[in-house]
Amino acid sequence: SNNSFTNFKLATELPAWSKLQKIYESQGKTLSVKQEFQKDAKRFEKLNKTFTNYDGSKILFDYSKNLVNDEIIAALIELAKEANVTGLRDAMFKGEHINSTEDRAVYHVALRNRANKPMYVDGVNVAPEVDSVLKHMKEFSEQVRSGEWKGYTGKKITDVVNIGIGGSDLGPVMVTEALKHYAGVLDVHFVSNIDGTHIAETLKVVDPETTLFLIASKTFTTAETITNANTAKNWFLSKTGNDPSHIAKHFAALSTNETEVAKFGIDTKNMFGFESWVGGRYSVWSAIGLSVALYIGYDNFEAFLKGAEAVDNHFTQTPLEDNIPLLGGLLSVWYNNFFGAQTHLVAPFDQYLHRFPAYLQQLSMESNGKSVTRGNVFTDYSTGSILFGEPATNAQHSFFQLVHQGTKLIPSDFILAAQSHNPIENKLHQKMLASNFFAQAEALMVGKDEEQVKAEGATGGLVPHKVFSGNRPTTSILAQKITPATLGALIAYYEHVTFTEGAIWNINSFDQWGVELGKVLAKVIGKELDNSSTISTHDASTNGLINQFKEWM
């Protein structure tokens, strides 16, 4: 492993780390946000940052309800400097191989370089190639959406089925759900799970004459995806007179394996590729986003890219003190490593964003769920928060109880768009939603003490049950509206938050060796399920489970 990007092995070696430990002991753990607001009339002014998108729309990030003061922020910024976060950031944006364990560039940022500035990997300016893929996506999506592209019987396409898993599924699923308001021409379906139910239920609701299948697998060898793709192909052929020539009008590939794509029967003109410097969980910006372009239209897809590009520009050009993703990442480190917080809640107060926490879960946990640093040593500190979330207000009626009164500190991000796409009942729904967005953050901060509880009439043993400790940190993210540009910006914000965390922890946020072992063992066990013999090659538990399964199957 190449550790040429950082000159420290462990974050705990950095002077600012020790300084933060002292600050935590002397003031951090007793800091009262409520009192900080009383002490500093300019606190909100100082600790909220407004991001202006390329189209002039704005997103406000309010960090003022976090467990910080000027001294803590200054020490966190010092930590970022000592960890050389900006150096690693600049190396990433220069196309250097910062994914050291796989010796690859990490260049998803090049996919949204709509300014078309030269961006180099290994001496090659990839901007023209990125632009070319987008032109291909634009031409293809416009043909399909307009009805110019026709199925084998001459009917226009009405449904798109994206078959992929992990990064080839989560991103498009989340984005198409989030931007449903911008759709209308086509219906889109996603099949990811190897569980036959997923593909079977999808095939029940589509018509082979009017369905386009997108097979999303970079290598075209991902077991789940290729199994599902073959099932889809067999279904399609069985419904269309077993004529393989029809496949060309109904299947496209999001892949780079031209040989396997051709073998499958897909016309390689309908192959949309992306390079090895695009990680799966960062691939929604690439050809993997074709289902998004088909669903919301290419112009909206480009606005989505431009929103992310605007955050990239902010991240690379803004001084640390005002750098929004950097501050978000530093706060995460502060809670994780000094307060011992193990989780991070993201609650979108927006039904369209209902898959956003699931998407961020992969982004954050697959990136930073590591325990070995770039210096090839095990960390002696916590990394990778457990990220979870659900849309509010639903979440208020499930796990918010634990956030308010549980024994764990759960730093939370609340997200709201001021303007609803559906301002029904004279904005009544939107006002109720917004009032909860503001109230929850306020309640978590101010809490409710014994005196207030008693004043409200509670007595005896009931009093402690109604007390809220408060001082529970939230970041409020208030957008004007969830547009393609806003969504692109929000995703890029969290990407760079994740990057900042990983840079400080000195881990490689861009590999995922943790997914390999299970895959290998599943292949071995797969063969054992093909015969009727009793299995005894594993531990007693695994043997017992396999044998019982075989008996019941």
């Epitope: 990997v121 001496g123 090659v124 300016n125 990839v126 023209p128 190639e129 632009d131 070319s132 893929v133 987008l134 032109k135 291909h136 031409e139 780079t256 394996n257 031209e258 040989t259 396997e260 051709a262 390689t268 192959m271 949309f272 590729g273 992306f274 390079e275 050809a287």
Partner: nanobody
């Protein structure tokens, strides 16, 4: 800056062999279908052979059995081995790269092949 630089052309007797080579720079070579085209004086440019990103080859009828195209992704190079040359193979030979995933292509400057006794 993208460059496709051909080499290996020259004068050869009928029945002889030549090996044309094209060195590419400034492109993600492994993502391009590479090809050789030729243009004889007063004629249209025509396909000789192509090789896809996956290594599948395609030859013009006149080249089949005599010419072999190959690629070396590690060194960003494509070669055309030409055997049993005859006077009809006399032409300027051009290296061509076509991006596999979108409308993007580049041409070399060409190298002259003359088959004459």
């Amino acid at each position: 800056q993208v460059q496709l630089v051909e080499s290996g052309g020259g004068l050869v007797r009928p029945g002889g062999s030549l090996r044309l080579s094209c060195a590419a720079s400034g492109i993600t070579f492994s993502s391009y279908t590479m090809g050789w085209y030729r243009q004889a004086p007063g004629k249209q440019r025509e396909l000789v052979a192509t090789i896809t990103t996956g290594g599948s080859t395609n030859y013009a009828v006149s080249a089949k059995g005599r010419f072999t195209i190959s690629r070396d992704n590690a060194n960003n190079r494509v070669t055309l081995q030409m055997n049993s040359l005859n006077s009809e193979d006399t032409a300027a030979y051009y290296c061509h790269s076509r991006f596999a995933y979108g409308p993007l292509e580049y041409w070399g400057q060409g190298t002259q092949v003359t088959v004459s006794s």
